[in-house]
Interface confidence: low
């Protein structure tokens, strides 16, 4: 019968033949008696077989990740007989990886939204990488993820490829951020190939900053002619945060006369100081009224950063209007 | 090689102001955050600031809000520090330091500081 | 009053490993990277351990840094004669929402 061993060529052999192993029939004697043949898909191109000996060699370079097995069969035919001495079987012959293959990552680009101030070990986005070389042989496959930039902000987890934060940041004073992973394979032993991707990682806005009156006293005048319902003037806060989340309401916190009212222009996010009742400039010729802004929409667990509204004090002028 | 050069020593009386300067080199001027350090004389060192020189933003320490501005020119990349209304116990060495780009990034590269005296 | 809290001096002799202690507390140290700066006399501060236990290139191997809890420590072997300087640590403060220095520890190195 046929005396089979296991076949391997390593792919990417430089050498212009590599010596795959032996045909050998056990009714072989060795007095060359014997030919050897070689047929299927890659006899007599990639592979070659040395017909009085059954000795197998690869001729060309293979590339396992192109095709990583080649299905043959042998033949033994007695020469002087002309006969088959084994009957033709079929065998394998496989190709070994060597690490040729850097990680890659397919899902490219990578672009993430975590809103700011997460806590540490927030999960900010998962990148994979993938390997053309073969998972069961060795550590060729296998790999490890680091971050090359991004640092202290986020942190990667080496065998998911999991992003998390790792410190606190602030959209305030920076709203987006590159973060530079790399995934090595070999699990990171000498020899390892890499490859790198980039992930933006925005931070989404929350409502960590109220909103601060720009002036802390306001002048405003009205004349005593007016009616009730008059803007006599606007007041302006601040709020470094964005969208909703600097959205405010005016409201008067201390007006003992009660003669005005402020209400919020939601488009400007100013405040209108309006004439609640008539004044009479003989009766009172000014006032003196303070007005508090907080923001519109303040989320249970924010509500340590809004704890004490802003306020400003308006001082209000009465033009006193000649009466007939 | 990177560098933070400041302006050169002043002497103020109680109630003036003074503006310090800090010209950068050797480096990107909007990559970096740029912060104020003081120590009066004999004593420990105590942050002032920080200033974003790319967004303007800026955050100042509590003890110094009302009274510290600080502020950047991009054509010179120069960032400006300055201090109002001065008492003696402002009295110190001003350092500018570079930050990183998050504000808890320790300071990498330090200005040679600049002396400012406040007496009558 | 510092809100991180360091000796304030410390003495050795040439050869030998001192240690600089630096307490604070969650809102600090607790909660943030811990760095250590050394000033030389007459000189601004120069960055000697960030991020807890990391050197900048230039700076000896004989300079380590840690971080427990609420406390850091700068350790110091081989002690030189051009070790003597102040030495300072420093961290963010996330309820001062700025940073905060340790008032410093002199380091005097006994011939």
């Known amino acids: 019968g046929w005396v089979w061993n296991q076949f391997f060529v390593p792919e990417e052999m430089n050498t212009t033949s590599h010596h795959v192993g032996r045909l050998r029939s056990d009714l072989d004697n060795g007095n060359n008696s014997f030919q050897y043949k070689l047929l299927g898909a890659g006899a007599g191109s990639t592979f070659i077989i040395d017909e009085r000996t059954g000795d197998i060699y690869a001729i060309e370079k293979l590339d396992r990740e192109e095709r990583s097995l080649y299905i043959l069969r042998a033949q033994v035919i007695d020469i002087t007989t002309g006969r088959a001495v084994e009957p033709e079987s079929e065998f394998v012959i496989k190709v070994s990886d060597i690490n040729d293959n850097e990680p890659k990552f397919l899902d490219e680009p990578y672009e993430a939204i975590v809103p700011e101030m997460s806590p540490e070990g927030t999960l900010v986005i998962q990148v994979t990488a993938s390997d053309a070389d073969d998972p069961s042989s060795g550590n060729n496959a296998r790999l490890l993820y680091s971050l090359l930039q991004g640092q202290p902000y986020f942190s990667v987890e080496p065998t998911t490829g999991v992003i998390r934060i790792s410190s606190k940041m602030d959209r305030e004073l920076q709203d987006e951020y590159w973060v530079i992973i790399q995934a090595k394979d070999m699990i990171g032993q000498p020899g390892a190939l890499s490859g790198t991707t980039s992930v933006l990682i925005k931070l989404s806005d929350v409502n960590d900053n109220k909103p601060i009156f720009k002036e802390s006293l306001y002048r405003l005048t009205v004349s005593e002619s007016a009616p009730t319902g008059t803007s006599i003037g606007t007041i302006m806060a601040y709020d470094n945060d964005i969208g909703e989340n600097a959205e405010m309401d005016y409201s008067i916190e201390e007006d003992d006369s009660q003669t005005f009212d402020i209400i919020t222009n939601h488009e400007t996010q100013e405040g209108i100081v309006i004439l609640k009742k008539k004044v009479n400039f003989e009766h009172q010729n000014h006032y003196g009224i303070r007005a508090k802004v907080k923001n519109h929409h303040v989320d249970e667990q924010l509500m340590k950063y809004h704890t004490e509204a802003s306020t400003t004090f308006i001082k209000i002028q009465v033009e006193d209007v000649d009466e007939p | 090689q990177v560098q933070l050069v400041q302006s050169g020593a002043e002497v103020k009386k109680p109630g003036a102001s003074v503006k310090v300067s800090c010209k950068v080199s050797?480096?990107?001027?909007?990559?970096?955050?740029i912060h104020w350090v003081r120590q009066a004389p004999g004593q420990g060192l105590e942050w002032m600031g920080i200033?974003?020189?790319?967004?303007?933003?800026?955050s100042y320490a509590q003890k110094f809000q009302g009274r510290v501005t600080m502020t950047r020119d991009t054509s010179t990349s120069t960032v400006f520090m300055e201090l109002s209304s001065l008492r003696s116990e402002d009295t110190a060495v001003y350092y500018c330091a570079r930050g990183g780009i998050q504000l808890w990034l320790h300071l990498d590269y330090w200005g040679q500081g600049t002396l400012v005296t406040v007496s009558s | 009053q510092s809100a991180l809290t360091q000796p304030p001096s410390v003495t050795g002799t040439p050869g030998q490993r001192v240690t600089i202690s630096c307490s604070g507390s969650?809102?600090?140290?607790?909660?943030?990277?811990v760095n250590w700066y050394q000033q030389l006399p007459g000189t601004a501060p120069k960055v000697l351990i960030y991020t807890n236990n990391q050197r900048p290139s230039g700076v000896p191997d004989r300079f380590s840094g840690s971080k427990s809890g609420t406390s850091a420590s700068l350790a110091i072997s081989g002690l030189q004669s051009e070790d003597e300087a102040d030495y300072y640590c420093?961290?963010?403060?996330?309820?001062?929402?700025?940073?905060?220095f340790g008032g410093g520890t002199k380091l005097t190195v006994l011939s």
């Open positions: 420093a961290t963010w403060d996330d309820s001062m929402n700025g940073w905060v």
């Open positions: 200033i974003n020189p790319i967004s303007v933003s800026t």
């Open positions: 050797g480096y990107t001027f909007t990559s970096y955050f």
């Open positions: 969650r809102s600090n140290i607790g909660s943030n990277f």
